[in-house]
Amino acid sequence: MRRERGRQGDSSSCERQVDRVNLKPCEQHIMQRIMGEQEQYDSYDIRSTRSSDQQQRCCDELNEMENTQRCMCEALQQIMENQCDRLQDRQMVQQFKRELMNLPQQCNFRAPQRCDLDVSGGRC
Protein backbone atom coordinates (compact mmCIF):
# COMPACT_ATOMS: atom_id res chain seq x y z
CA MET A 1 0.00 0.00 0.00
CA ARG A 2 1.36 3.39 -0.95
CA ARG A 3 1.65 5.77 1.93
CA GLU A 4 2.22 9.51 1.84
CA ARG A 5 2.77 10.61 5.37
CA GLY A 6 1.65 13.94 6.66
CA ARG A 7 2.39 15.22 10.13
CA GLN A 8 2.69 12.43 12.63
CA GLY A 9 1.22 14.30 15.60
CA ASP A 10 3.28 16.05 18.21
CA SER A 11 5.94 14.43 20.34
CA SER A 12 4.64 16.00 23.56
CA SER A 13 1.48 13.91 23.23
CA CYS A 14 3.70 10.82 22.98
CA GLU A 15 5.48 11.89 26.15
CA ARG A 16 2.12 12.16 27.89
CA GLN A 17 1.09 8.72 26.66
CA VAL A 18 4.39 7.17 27.73
CA ASP A 19 4.02 8.79 31.16
CA ARG A 20 0.60 7.19 31.57
CA VAL A 21 1.69 3.59 30.94
CA ASN A 22 3.54 1.34 33.36
CA LEU A 23 6.88 0.44 31.79
CA LYS A 24 8.07 -1.60 34.77
CA PRO A 25 7.07 -4.97 33.22
CA CYS A 26 9.13 -4.09 30.11
CA GLU A 27 12.12 -3.13 32.24
CA GLN A 28 11.79 -6.33 34.28
CA HIS A 29 11.38 -8.45 31.17
CA ILE A 30 14.55 -7.08 29.57
CA MET A 31 16.53 -7.36 32.80
CA GLN A 32 15.44 -10.97 33.11
CA ARG A 33 16.58 -11.61 29.56
CA ILE A 34 20.05 -10.22 30.10
CA MET A 35 20.57 -11.45 33.68
CA GLY A 36 19.04 -14.88 33.26
CA GLU A 37 17.98 -16.17 36.66
CA GLN A 38 21.03 -14.77 38.45
CA GLU A 39 20.25 -13.51 41.91
CA GLN A 40 22.64 -10.57 41.73
CA TYR A 41 19.91 -8.40 40.24
CA ASP A 42 17.89 -7.83 43.39
CA SER A 43 16.18 -4.54 42.58
CA TYR A 44 13.17 -6.58 41.50
CA ASP A 45 12.23 -10.05 42.64
CA ILE A 46 12.82 -11.40 39.17
CA ARG A 47 11.97 -14.96 40.16
CA SER A 48 8.42 -14.10 41.11
CA THR A 49 7.17 -13.79 37.55
CA ARG A 50 8.23 -15.85 34.55
CA SER A 51 9.85 -13.88 31.72
CA SER A 52 7.10 -14.81 29.26
CA ASP A 53 4.48 -13.40 31.66
CA GLN A 54 6.45 -10.20 32.02
CA GLN A 55 6.74 -9.96 28.24
CA GLN A 56 2.99 -10.26 27.86
CA ARG A 57 2.38 -7.63 30.52
CA CYS A 58 4.92 -5.39 28.82
CA CYS A 59 3.22 -5.77 25.43
CA ASP A 60 -0.16 -5.11 27.03
CA GLU A 61 1.13 -1.90 28.59
CA LEU A 62 2.66 -0.69 25.30
CA ASN A 63 -0.64 -1.45 23.62
CA GLU A 64 -2.35 0.92 26.06
CA MET A 65 -0.79 3.88 24.26
CA GLU A 66 -3.27 5.49 21.88
CA ASN A 67 -0.75 5.45 19.06
CA THR A 68 1.57 2.62 19.98
CA GLN A 69 3.47 2.60 16.70
CA ARG A 70 4.19 6.33 16.58
CA CYS A 71 5.08 6.56 20.28
CA MET A 72 7.17 3.38 20.41
CA CYS A 73 10.45 5.27 20.15
CA GLU A 74 9.63 7.48 23.14
CA ALA A 75 8.62 4.39 25.15
CA LEU A 76 11.88 2.59 24.36
CA GLN A 77 13.88 5.71 25.17
CA GLN A 78 12.10 6.04 28.51
CA ILE A 79 12.85 2.41 29.37
CA MET A 80 16.53 3.01 28.55
CA GLU A 81 16.54 6.19 30.62
CA ASN A 82 14.87 4.46 33.60
CA GLN A 83 17.33 1.56 33.67
CA CYS A 84 20.48 3.40 32.69
CA ASP A 85 21.86 3.78 36.21
CA ARG A 86 21.31 0.07 36.96
CA LEU A 87 23.45 -1.10 34.04
CA GLN A 88 26.82 -1.91 35.52
CA ASP A 89 29.14 -1.81 32.51
CA ARG A 90 29.36 -1.12 28.80
CA GLN A 91 28.65 -4.75 27.90
CA MET A 92 25.46 -4.72 29.95
CA VAL A 93 24.38 -1.48 28.30
CA GLN A 94 24.85 -3.04 24.86
CA GLN A 95 22.95 -6.19 25.89
CA PHE A 96 20.11 -4.12 27.29
CA LYS A 97 19.97 -2.03 24.13
CA ARG A 98 19.91 -5.14 21.92
CA GLU A 99 17.03 -6.62 23.90
CA LEU A 100 15.24 -3.27 23.86
CA MET A 101 15.50 -3.11 20.07
CA ASN A 102 13.90 -6.55 19.85
CA LEU A 103 11.00 -5.61 22.09
CA PRO A 104 8.65 -4.17 19.41
CA GLN A 105 9.02 -7.32 17.33
CA GLN A 106 8.33 -9.52 20.36
CA CYS A 107 5.10 -7.58 20.85
CA ASN A 108 4.22 -7.77 17.12
CA PHE A 109 4.81 -4.06 16.48
CA ARG A 110 7.02 -2.57 13.78
CA ALA A 111 10.42 -1.37 15.00
CA PRO A 112 10.50 2.43 15.04
CA GLN A 113 12.50 4.19 12.37
CA ARG A 114 15.03 6.87 13.23
CA CYS A 115 14.89 6.03 16.93
CA ASP A 116 18.05 7.01 18.79
CA LEU A 117 18.38 4.96 21.96
CA ASP A 118 21.52 6.80 23.11
CA VAL A 119 19.45 9.33 25.01
CA SER A 120 21.02 9.33 28.43
CA GLY A 121 23.49 12.14 27.80
CA GLY A 122 26.49 9.83 27.98
CA ARG A 123 25.45 8.23 31.29
CA CYS A 124 24.81 4.91 29.57
Partner: antibody
Framework: QKQLVESGGGLDQPAGSLKLSCKDS????????MTWVHQAPGKGLEWIAN????????DYLDSVRGRFTISSDNTQNMVDLEMNSLTAADMAIYFC????????????????WGQGTLVTVSS | QPALTQPSSVSGALGGSVTITCSGT????????VSWYQQLPGSVPKLLMF???KRPSGIPERFSGSKSGTTASLTISGLQPEDEADYYC???????????FGGGTKLTVL
Amino acid sequence: QKQLVESGGGLDQPAGSLKLSCKDSGFTLSTFYMTWVHQAPGKGLEWIANIKQDGSEKDYLDSVRGRFTISSDNTQNMVDLEMNSLTAADMAIYFCARNGLQDSYSGDFFDHWGQGTLVTVSS
Amino acid sequence: QPALTQPSSVSGALGGSVTITCSGTGSNIGHNYVSWYQQLPGSVPKLLMFDNTKRPSGIPERFSGSKSGTTASLTISGLQPEDEADYYCATWDADLSAVLFGGGTKLTVL
Protein backbone atom coordinates in the same frame (compact mmCIF):
# COMPACT_ATOMS: atom_id res chain seq x y z
CA GLN B 1 32.25 4.37 -9.84
CA LYS B 2 29.19 5.33 -7.79
CA GLN B 3 27.52 8.36 -9.30
CA LEU B 4 24.22 10.21 -9.29
CA VAL B 5 23.39 12.45 -12.24
CA GLU B 6 20.54 14.98 -12.21
CA SER B 7 18.89 16.39 -15.31
CA GLY B 8 15.85 18.45 -16.24
CA GLY B 9 16.78 21.79 -14.71
CA GLY B 10 16.33 25.00 -16.63
CA LEU B 11 14.36 28.24 -16.91
CA ASP B 12 10.62 28.35 -16.38
CA GLN B 13 7.98 30.98 -15.74
CA PRO B 14 6.20 31.42 -12.41
CA ALA B 15 3.33 28.90 -12.10
CA GLY B 16 5.15 26.70 -14.64
CA SER B 17 6.26 23.07 -14.32
CA LEU B 18 9.52 21.14 -14.54
CA LYS B 19 10.45 17.51 -14.11
CA LEU B 20 13.84 16.71 -12.63
CA SER B 21 15.37 13.26 -12.97
CA CYS B 22 18.16 11.53 -11.11
CA LYS B 23 19.88 8.49 -12.57
CA ASP B 24 22.40 6.36 -10.79
CA SER B 25 25.34 4.39 -11.99
CA GLY B 26 27.36 2.08 -9.84
CA PHE B 27 24.82 1.00 -7.26
CA THR B 28 21.27 -0.29 -7.10
CA LEU B 29 18.88 2.37 -5.89
CA SER B 30 16.14 -0.14 -5.14
CA THR B 31 17.65 -0.96 -1.74
CA PHE B 32 17.73 2.65 -0.57
CA TYR B 33 15.71 5.71 0.24
CA MET B 34 16.37 8.62 -2.11
CA THR B 35 16.17 12.31 -1.33
CA TRP B 36 15.97 15.66 -3.09
CA VAL B 37 17.64 18.65 -1.44
CA HIS B 38 17.79 22.17 -2.80
CA GLN B 39 20.01 25.18 -2.20
CA ALA B 40 18.93 28.67 -3.17
CA PRO B 41 21.69 31.00 -4.39
CA GLY B 42 23.90 31.99 -1.44
CA LYS B 43 21.68 30.11 1.03
CA GLY B 44 21.83 26.88 3.01
CA LEU B 45 20.67 23.36 2.25
CA GLU B 46 16.95 22.55 2.44
CA TRP B 47 15.46 19.07 2.28
CA ILE B 48 12.58 18.69 -0.20
CA ALA B 49 11.42 15.09 -0.26
CA ASN B 50 12.24 11.44 0.55
CA ILE B 51 11.08 8.30 -1.18
CA LYS B 52 11.56 4.68 -0.24
CA GLN B 53 12.61 3.08 -3.49
CA ASP B 54 9.67 0.69 -3.63
CA GLY B 55 7.47 3.79 -3.56
CA SER B 56 5.74 2.77 -0.33
CA GLU B 57 6.79 5.85 1.63
CA LYS B 58 7.02 9.47 0.52
CA ASP B 59 7.64 12.49 2.71
CA TYR B 60 7.60 16.15 1.66
CA LEU B 61 8.58 19.53 2.97
CA ASP B 62 5.34 21.33 3.88
CA SER B 63 5.91 24.18 1.42
CA VAL B 64 6.11 21.80 -1.57
CA ARG B 65 3.48 19.25 -0.53
CA GLY B 66 0.75 19.15 -3.19
CA ARG B 67 2.95 20.95 -5.75
CA PHE B 68 5.90 18.57 -6.00
CA THR B 69 5.72 14.80 -6.55
CA ILE B 70 8.61 12.43 -5.96
CA SER B 71 8.52 9.09 -7.78
CA SER B 72 10.84 6.22 -8.57
CA ASP B 73 11.36 3.78 -11.39
CA ASN B 74 13.38 0.80 -10.23
CA THR B 75 13.68 -0.67 -13.70
CA GLN B 76 15.50 2.44 -14.88
CA ASN B 77 17.23 3.17 -11.55
CA MET B 78 15.67 6.65 -11.69
CA VAL B 79 14.12 9.02 -9.18
CA ASP B 80 12.05 11.95 -10.47
CA LEU B 81 10.82 15.16 -8.93
CA GLU B 82 7.86 16.68 -10.73
CA MET B 83 7.49 20.35 -9.80
CA ASN B 84 4.30 22.31 -10.46
CA SER B 85 3.11 25.85 -9.65
CA LEU B 86 6.70 27.05 -9.49
CA THR B 87 7.47 30.28 -7.66
CA ALA B 88 10.56 32.43 -7.30
CA ALA B 89 11.16 30.75 -3.94
CA ASP B 90 11.74 27.44 -5.78
CA MET B 91 14.72 28.86 -7.67
CA ALA B 92 17.75 26.85 -6.53
CA ILE B 93 20.24 24.14 -7.32
CA TYR B 94 18.49 20.78 -6.84
CA PHE B 95 20.59 17.88 -5.61
CA CYS B 96 19.54 14.29 -5.56
CA ALA B 97 21.15 12.19 -2.84
CA ARG B 98 21.14 8.62 -1.67
CA ASN B 99 19.73 8.35 1.83
CA GLY B 100 21.34 5.72 4.04
CA LEU B 101 18.26 5.39 6.24
CA GLN B 102 17.66 1.78 7.21
CA ASP B 103 14.39 0.22 8.28
CA SER B 104 14.88 0.80 12.01
CA TYR B 105 17.12 2.40 14.62
CA SER B 106 19.07 4.52 12.18
CA GLY B 107 18.86 8.08 10.93
CA ASP B 108 18.63 9.87 7.60
CA PHE B 109 22.05 10.57 6.12
CA PHE B 110 23.07 11.43 2.60
CA ASP B 111 26.20 9.59 1.55
CA HIS B 112 26.17 10.08 -2.23
CA TRP B 113 25.21 13.33 -3.95
CA GLY B 114 24.73 14.35 -7.55
CA GLN B 115 26.36 17.49 -8.93
CA GLY B 116 23.04 19.32 -8.90
CA THR B 117 20.81 20.87 -11.55
CA LEU B 118 19.85 24.55 -11.59
CA VAL B 119 16.20 25.59 -11.65
CA THR B 120 15.52 29.22 -12.54
CA VAL B 121 12.06 30.74 -12.20
CA SER B 122 11.60 34.05 -13.96
CA SER B 123 9.07 35.82 -16.14
CA GLN C 1 14.55 30.27 9.56
CA PRO C 2 15.83 26.71 10.11
CA ALA C 3 14.49 24.85 13.15
CA LEU C 4 18.03 23.60 13.88
CA THR C 5 20.21 26.43 15.15
CA GLN C 6 23.90 26.65 14.25
CA PRO C 7 26.30 29.57 14.78
CA SER C 8 26.62 31.42 11.48
CA SER C 9 30.42 31.41 11.72
CA VAL C 10 33.27 30.03 13.81
CA SER C 11 37.01 30.38 13.49
CA GLY C 12 40.02 28.53 14.79
CA ALA C 13 43.79 28.67 14.57
CA LEU C 14 45.72 26.42 12.22
CA GLY C 15 46.37 23.15 14.08
CA GLY C 16 43.83 24.04 16.74
CA SER C 17 40.30 22.78 17.19
CA VAL C 18 36.75 24.10 16.93
CA THR C 19 33.34 22.80 17.95
CA ILE C 20 30.22 23.58 15.93
CA THR C 21 26.94 23.15 17.77
CA CYS C 22 23.50 22.30 16.40
CA SER C 23 20.57 22.97 18.67
CA GLY C 24 17.06 21.59 18.23
CA THR C 25 14.13 20.23 20.21
CA GLY C 26 12.79 16.95 21.56
CA SER C 27 10.93 16.18 18.35
CA ASN C 28 14.08 16.35 16.23
CA ILE C 29 17.56 16.09 17.76
CA GLY C 30 16.18 14.82 21.06
CA HIS C 31 14.72 11.66 19.55
CA ASN C 32 16.52 11.18 16.27
CA TYR C 33 20.00 10.69 14.84
CA VAL C 34 22.08 13.61 13.57
CA SER C 35 24.31 13.78 10.50
CA TRP C 36 26.89 16.43 9.49
CA TYR C 37 27.99 17.70 6.06
CA GLN C 38 30.89 19.74 4.74
CA GLN C 39 30.38 21.93 1.69
CA LEU C 40 33.49 23.46 0.18
CA PRO C 41 32.97 26.66 -1.84
CA GLY C 42 31.28 25.88 -5.16
CA SER C 43 31.14 22.18 -4.39
CA VAL C 44 28.68 19.43 -3.51
CA PRO C 45 27.93 18.61 0.17
CA LYS C 46 29.94 15.73 1.62
CA LEU C 47 28.88 13.46 4.47
CA LEU C 48 31.17 13.82 7.52
CA MET C 49 29.24 12.10 10.27
CA PHE C 50 26.06 10.01 10.60
CA ASP C 51 24.06 8.46 13.44
CA ASN C 52 25.56 11.11 15.75
CA THR C 53 29.07 9.71 16.04
CA LYS C 54 29.85 7.47 13.05
CA ARG C 55 32.40 8.51 10.44
CA PRO C 56 32.08 7.26 6.86
CA SER C 57 35.19 5.62 5.47
CA GLY C 58 37.69 8.18 4.26
CA ILE C 59 36.77 10.84 6.84
CA PRO C 60 39.76 11.56 9.11
CA GLU C 61 39.57 10.84 12.83
CA ARG C 62 40.08 14.51 13.60
CA PHE C 63 36.38 14.94 12.80
CA SER C 64 34.20 13.73 15.67
CA GLY C 65 30.53 14.00 16.56
CA SER C 66 28.52 13.86 19.75
CA LYS C 67 25.00 14.45 20.99
CA SER C 68 23.57 15.35 24.36
CA GLY C 69 19.88 15.99 24.86
CA THR C 70 18.70 18.35 22.13
CA THR C 71 22.16 19.57 21.08
CA ALA C 72 24.57 17.89 18.67
CA SER C 73 28.19 18.91 18.19
CA LEU C 74 30.85 18.49 15.52
CA THR C 75 34.44 18.89 16.67
CA ILE C 76 37.28 19.38 14.21
CA SER C 77 40.79 19.10 15.66
CA GLY C 78 44.13 19.66 13.97
CA LEU C 79 42.56 22.38 11.80
CA GLN C 80 43.91 22.61 8.26
CA PRO C 81 43.41 25.29 5.58
CA GLU C 82 41.29 22.88 3.51
CA ASP C 83 38.77 22.67 6.37
CA GLU C 84 37.51 26.15 5.46
CA ALA C 85 33.96 25.40 4.34
CA ASP C 86 30.31 25.54 5.33
CA TYR C 87 29.15 22.86 7.77
CA TYR C 88 25.55 21.68 8.13
CA CYS C 89 23.80 19.43 10.62
CA ALA C 90 20.64 17.49 9.73
CA THR C 91 18.09 15.30 11.46
CA TRP C 92 14.53 14.04 11.14
CA ASP C 93 11.71 15.89 12.87
CA ALA C 94 8.97 13.50 14.01
CA ASP C 95 6.35 16.24 14.37
CA LEU C 96 6.91 17.63 10.88
CA SER C 97 7.68 14.30 9.18
CA ALA C 98 10.57 16.06 7.51
CA VAL C 99 14.36 16.23 7.48
CA LEU C 100 15.66 19.49 8.89
CA PHE C 101 19.01 21.07 8.04
CA GLY C 102 20.69 23.62 10.25
CA GLY C 103 21.33 27.05 8.77
CA GLY C 104 25.01 26.25 8.22
CA THR C 105 28.22 27.40 9.88
CA LYS C 106 31.07 29.03 7.98
CA LEU C 107 34.44 27.87 9.33
CA THR C 108 37.46 30.13 8.94
CA VAL C 109 40.96 28.79 9.68
CA LEU C 110 43.22 31.58 10.93
